[in-house]
Interface confidence: low
């Protein structure tokens, strides 16, 4: 599923991401835009053999199990395939664990490079939330 901007903002808010660990909803929508272009089925291979999955590009080395990544920790205790669902519950729940891990949203390279320090509220402007 490819979400619309406001559609995703509403879904993320429904799942409790707004101001989760101090990160406003705009940060999450911005991260999803530059990680996956709002596509729940996005996958990208990394040079270390791991793969990033889903709308927030969650990594199989640490957070989920895809049965294919040597030394996977599976800290979210989920199959990576769950992160590709049009239902973003699994991605959101895992993201909450990631953002609580110490580095906050710096765990997402795209957020660090494209969203951090910008007017992230623009990503939810005009949305009925």
């Amino acid at each position: 599923k490819v979400f619309g901007r406001c559609e995703l903002a509403a879904a993320m808010k429904r799942h409790g991401l707004d101001n989760y660990r101090g990160y406003s909803l705009g940060n999450w929508v911005c991260a999803a835009k530059f990680e996956s272009n709002f596509n729940t089925q996005a996958t990208n291979r990394n040079t270390d053999g791991s793969t990033d999955y889903g709308i927030l590009q969650i990594n199989s080395r640490w957070w989920c199990n895809d049965g294919r990544t040597p030394g996977s920790r599976n800290l979210c205790n989920i199959p990576c395939s769950a992160l590709l669902s049009s239902d973003i519950t699994a991605s959101v729940n895992c993201a909450k664990k990631i953002v609580s891990d110490g580095n906050g949203m710096n765990a997402w390279v795209a957020w660090r490079n494209r969203c951090k320090g910008t007017d992230v509220q623009a990503w939810i402007r005009g949305c009925r939330l």
């Epitope: 596509n39 089925q41 996005a42 996958t43 990208n44 291979r45 053999g49 895809d66 049965g67 294919r68 040597p70 030394g71 395939s81 769950a82 590709l84 669902s85």
Partner: antibody, heavy 115, light 107 residues
Framework: QVQLQESGAEVMKPGASVKISCKAT????????IEWVKQRPGHGLEWIGE????????YYNEKFKGKATFTADTSSNTAYMQLSSLTSEDSAVYYC?????????WGQGTTLTVS | DIELTQSPATLSVTPGDSVSLSCRAS??????LHWYQQKPHESPRLLIK???QSMSGIPSRFSGSGSGTDFTLSINSVETEDFGMYFC?????????FGGGTKLEIK
Amino acid sequence: QVQLQESGAEVMKPGASVKISCKATGYTFTTYWIEWVKQRPGHGLEWIGEILPGSGSTYYNEKFKGKATFTADTSSNTAYMQLSSLTSEDSAVYYCARGDGWYGYWGQGTTLTVS
Amino acid sequence: DIELTQSPATLSVTPGDSVSLSCRASQSISNNLHWYQQKPHESPRLLIKYTSQSMSGIPSRFSGSGSGTDFTLSINSVETEDFGMYFCQQSNSWPRTFGGGTKLEIK
């Protein structure tokens, strides 16, 4: 139960292209990788590459880049592999398999003869 | 690419014998090694995943061991239905690679 059904045997002329299909049933097609494997007598099994049908993401063995192209149709739960510029070296049995790191489910194989 | 070398290439045994098939990797692959059986004109069948995890429906006489670079598939008291080709496969890195196979035949 999980099943992968491949298309029938093909006899092709050198230089031609062929498209092999693999229809999946019994599981969520979009969220598992489909792997393609080549088997020639005396050459064992060779991994060609894989496609994740839900996203269209593909990864190819360098050896088969330019030779094999993967596509998938999620409306019919079918994965495809097209082989181009066929030569006698492409004569083989081609298998699709569901990828979990290991391959627990295989198609019955498609025999391709190039002559 | 990781190369998997299987030995012996052919193993001639009598039903009731116990045998060990070897698979050696060109570099460490942890436990990311899987074993398949293939009969003539059939698709491969997964026997063991991740070195030692038996698949459901596979007879208990099949077992796997090893780690790093050296792996073994053991068949305790071979039965006539066990004859065929055996392949190992690694999932430690891409491209996925298979061993050249061991042919288990009747003596």
